[in-house]
């Protein structure tokens, strides 16, 4: 690092708000797409290149000039598994977090021309190639269609689709956001014979309605109506089907075979929460009760003679939590062995840590193959000899991530593949394996600048550096950058981790203002080893503010004792722990305890508001962006997972005493900035409207900003710049900064 320890003598520029908003310093990614066990695609100067993983040589797969005459701006592309066709996506129109509609064309790579016959319709909701060959499944107007050949007519699979009512092969709002984290509800079998799909019925689901103001010329605002089940409201129902795409006929309608939920689910409200193909003719389904502490995995086999799917109780696997909910957010997915007779799955062990358990499909009990006071984050690949996983075991740091492999013939033989590669720079890895796991790309995202490398599984040898961000490194040498401290405090004999973004030339003998950046939702993690260039970088670098985050009770990846501490009690311990963290930071000697602020977005906005409304006297001011204010306003799947039902027999009392509004009086002691997008489909504007009303009713002066037609991300270019500029002014004013 250039410069000196003396801040006054350091002539380098700081990282400014403009640098953040204009993205002056860009992190370079290396986004590859594996197309086989030894080749991947990479986009360079808009050419699509195909790389050989072993040798690193490349050739042009598709030149950027290919579609010069296309007439549309291509948003994305997808190559068929057999490499014969490329699907081009354009006219992209965003819907919710994952969902969008688009237009598609298919380009024949052999004939080097666009297919003009039997085109996929405009406003298609989802398209996916089969895993092998070049079949296509797509959803249009809430119905599913299959193309056996790109140039031939489609077969219609479903006929029941109806906007906002029946969804075939796509998710409704709550399943998209809270269950599958995807718009797709289609699952091809490994060889593309079968297409499994879910059907969601929102007939009885209440609608959220909000105004969309649109262009200034629109005299009457549009009303957006979305089926959205709030806590305790009527939920969507789900059905599951499988269709054989090898027996489709243009003469008769496709026959979809239903697989019903287990009876333990049918007796009440329930969700479909995972679909995984085990073999060509075996599928596993996970179902979850509305009270999300009980899930069932069904393993269903195809009966060729009848064309039906049989799910025997002897092969059911139940997962239950006595201390909270099942899974981190939902039950984890199984990873099946090649024969489909056994699988590996991350579940909570006796001590409440999430580890890998080995199941045989006909046995109820499983064998844990990992153990310890750390957690497995994800199973990344499974071969005949090894299972590869990411965990936070290394050096006992919950905020780190490393890649491990475990020998399946001897579970004691575990190797960390990433720990010692670059231990100072790289402590937080993710991975992308080739089709059969012969090669893998390691993506290191901190604490140093991101580093992308390619490796061979044969000997775990590093093959080459793909991107090291050296250009950015050179640029940042000329910037006074903050440093990041990751450490823990001990409260009630338990370690709780925090991170601090410290100003350049940090001097522990000086006093700094502190901003607590909070999320604090169940299974969240804000203290980690990731390198980021964000608003906090500006605040620390230019404004000399310490930006801290703290993972208290309810946070994830440290065992269920910590995570399930807030079960049925949102708005309690996770809120108290942020206040306690600020007190602890105050005692460290370098924090100006008259200038402590807090801010958060979404769940973080809720916690910020609850903290500011606690009357603790610790915080001078705070900002809540798109906060939850009362759990009865938020969606059923997320809320009920942690809070149960808002009924007198269940947990209504705590729903009612965990609102921001009930703390309105205490806001007289703090400076508060409340921000929300008017078109927030997720945390509805209603939530902030009710905070505002409650504050007005008790005479609290506060600041507020709405963002017209912005959703939960407030992410349009102008709104993004405006919100961060506005928040910067507020924080600077609060801290009496020039």
């Amino acid at each position: 690092n250039k410069g000196t320890d003396d801040a006054t003598a350091d002539s380098r520029k700081t990282y400014t708000l403009t640098d953040y908003l204009k993205n002056t310093y860009r992190l370079k990614l290396y986004s590859l797409r594996w197309i086989s066990d030894h080749e991947y695609l990479y986009k360079q100067e808009n050419n699509i290149l195909v790389f050989n993983a072993e040798y690193g040589n490349s050739s042009v797969f598709l030149e950027n000039s290919t579609f010069d005459e296309f007439g549309h701006s291509i948003n994305d592309y997808s190559i068929s598994p057999d490499g014969q066709f490329i699907l081009l996506e354009y006219n992209y129109v965003k819907q919710w977090r994952h969902s969008y509609t688009a237009s598609y064309d298919i380009y024949d790579l052999n004939k080097r021309q666009l297919i003009t016959e039997e085109r996929i319709p405009n406003n298609t909701q989802w398209v996916t190639w089969s895993p092998v060959g070049h079949k296509l499944a797509y959803v249009w107007n809430n119905d599913i269609y299959v193309k056996i050949e790109p140039n031939l007519p489609s077969y219609r699979i479903t006929w029941t689709g109806k906007e906002d009512i029946i969804y075939n092969g796509i998710t409704d709002w709550v399943y998209e956001e809270e269950v599958f984290s995807a718009y797709s509800a289609l699952w091809w079998s490994p060889n593309g014979t079968f297409l499994a799909y879910a059907q969601f019925n929102d007939t009885e689901v209440p609608l959220i309605e909000y105004s969309f103001y649109s262009d200034e010329s629109l005299q009457y605002p549009k009303t957006v109506r979305v089926p959205y089940p709030k806590a305790g409201a009527v939920n969507p129902t789900v059905k599951f089907f499988v269709v054989n795409t090898d027996s489709l006929s243009s003469v008769t309608n496709a026959t979809s075979i239903q697989i019903t939920a287990p009876a333990s689910m049918l007796i009440g409200d329930h969700y479909l929460c995972d679909v995984t193909w085990a073999t060509q003719e075996r599928i596993s389904l996970q179902w979850l009760r509305r009270i999300q502490n009980y899930s069932v995995m069904d393993i269903c086999d195809y009966d060729e003679s009848s064309g039906r799917w049989n799910c025997l109780v002897a092969r059911q696997h139940i997962e239950m939590s006595t201390t909270g909910w099942v899974g981190r957010f939902r039950p984890s997915e199984p990873h099946f062995t090649l024969d489909g007779n056994s699988f590996y799955k991350i579940i909570s062990n006796e001590e409440g840590y999430r580890h890998i358990c080995y199941f045989q499909i006909d046995k109820k009990d499983c064998t844990f193959i990992t153990k310890g006071t750390w957690e497995v984050i994800g199973i990344e690949a499974l071969t005949s000899d090894y299972l590869y996983y990411i965990s936070n075991e290394y050096k006992g740091m919950p905020g780190g991530r490393n890649l491990y492999k475990i020998q399946l013939s001897d579970y004691t033989k575990v190797t960390c593949l990433s720990c010692e590669l670059n231990p100072e720079r790289c402590q937080y890895y993710s991975v992308s394996f080739s089709k059969e796991a012969k090669y893998y790309q390691l993506r290191c995202s901190g604490p140093g600048l991101p580093l992308y490398t390619l490796h061979s599984s044969v000997n775990d040898k590093g093959l080459r550096v793909l991107e090291d961000n050296s250009a950015l490194d050179k640029m940042l040498q000329n910037v006074q950058m903050p440093s990041k401290k990751l450490d823990f405090i001990i409260l009630n004999e338990t370690k709780f981790w925090y991170q601090m973004i410290l100003p350049p030339h940090f001097d522990k003998s000086k006093k700094y203002p502190l901003l607590l950046d909070v999320y604090a939702g169940p299974c969240s993690q804000k203290a980690d080893t990731v390198f980021r260039l964000n608003w906090a970088t500006y605040l620390a670098s230019t404004e000399n503010i310490i930006v801290a985050s703290f993972d208290g009770r309810g946070s994830g990846y440290q065992g269920d004792k910590i995570m399930h501490a807030i079960n049925r009690r949102l708005g309690t311990f996770e809120v108290e722990d942020q206040i306690e963290a600020a007190r602890q930071f105050s005692k460290m000697g370098f924090v100006d305890n008259k200038r402590i602020a807090i801010w958060g977005w979404s769940y973080g906005g809720y916690v910020t508001s609850m903290v500011l409304g606690s009357g603790s006297g610790v915080f001078k001011c705070g900002i809540a962006v798109a906060p939850v204010s009362r759990w009865e306003y938020y969606d059923s799947v997320y809320t009920e997972r942690y809070m149960g039902l808002p009924t007198p027999e269940d947990n209504l009392d705590h729903y009612r005493n965990s609102t921001v509004m009930s703390r309105a009086e205490n806001f007289k002691q703090v400076e508060y900035l409340l921000i929300h997008g008017t078109a927030d489909d997720n945390v509805h504007f209603q939530q902030s409207a009710q905070i505002s009303k409650a504050l007005v009713d008790v005479g609290v002066d506060f600041q507020a900003m709405w963002y017209t037609d912005e959703d939960h991300g407030i992410a349009s270019s102008t709104a993004h710049q405006h919100i961060y500029t506005h928040m910067s002014h507020f924080i600077k004013q609060c801290f009496s900064l020039p």
């Epitope: 019903t260 009876a263 049918l266 069904d298 025997l312 109780v313």
Partner: antibody, heavy 119, light 107 residues
């Protein structure tokens, strides 16, 4: 070998109570669900109640809701049907059974126990 | 609740006959239908699960078919031991419901 054995049936007056037992062997009831099905003399089969011992979930036919309670003791591998406020129309042979597949088909049944409600 | 209606209520047949029993549901049956055989004084025995799956140990002369609301049990060649009462049952929608039964008697 999988077996289900019911006991506890008998003659009882209207308004009275009776507790039926269903002892399972050859499998753990924790891993299955147990269901009571009854058959009035000369009549068809009627589902009465179900329990999933591992989760503690229960479900009842409308005709017995509020009067009958299904329970299980996993340590004894036994399910029970507590029948209160008995009526003449509850007279039947009571069978316990377990599910075979997710479609609700029952592969193993007990031999049945007769409950007669009469004054 | 889904009503299951069996027809006929009873039938007379001879050994070797092909016998068909139908079961009609009041609405689409989600999962499928099971068929049971019951002899006097005995518990029901599972014959067919999931509409068409032949349960272990059940002779292959028994078969099941159907979808939606209409389901069929077929005995391809009636044997002396097959004279009994047969019940259909759906369990894919809660609550479980049974047909009223079909009695197969010797002609």
């Amino acid at each position: 070998e999988v077996q289900l054995v019911e006991s506890g049936g008998g003659l009882v007056q209207p308004g009275g109570s009776l507790r039926l037992s269903c002892a399972a062997s050859g499998f753990a009831i924790n891993n299955y669900s147990i269901h009571w099905v009854r058959q009035a003399p000369g009549k068809g089969l009627e589902w009465v109640a179900s329990i999933w011992p591992y989760g503690g979930f229960t479900s009842y036919a409308d005709s017995v809701k509020g009067r009958f309670t299904i329970s299980a003791d996993t340590s004894k591998n036994t399910a029970y049907l507590q029948m209160n406020s008995l009526r003449a129309e509850d007279t039947a042979v009571y069978y316990c059974a377990r599910f075979f597949s997710s479609y609700g088909d029952m592969d193993y049944w007990g031999q049945g126990t007769l409950v007669t409600v009469s004054s | 609740d889904i009503q299951m209606t069996q027809s006929p209520s009873s039938l007379s047949a001879s050994v070797g006959d092909r016998v068909t029993i139908t079961c009609r549901a009041s609405q689409d049956v989600s999962g499928g239908v099971a068929w049971y055989q019951q002899k006097p004084g005995k518990a029901p025995k599972l014959l067919i699960y999931g509409t068409s799956g032949l349960y272990s140990g059940v002779p292959s002369r028994f078969s099941g078919s159907g979808s939606g609301t209409d389901f069929t049990l077929t005995i391809s060649s009636l044997q002396p031991e097959d004279f009994a009462t047969y019940y259909c049952q759906q369990g894919g929608d809660w609550p479980i419901t049974f047909g009223q039964g079909t009695k197969v008697e010797i002609k």
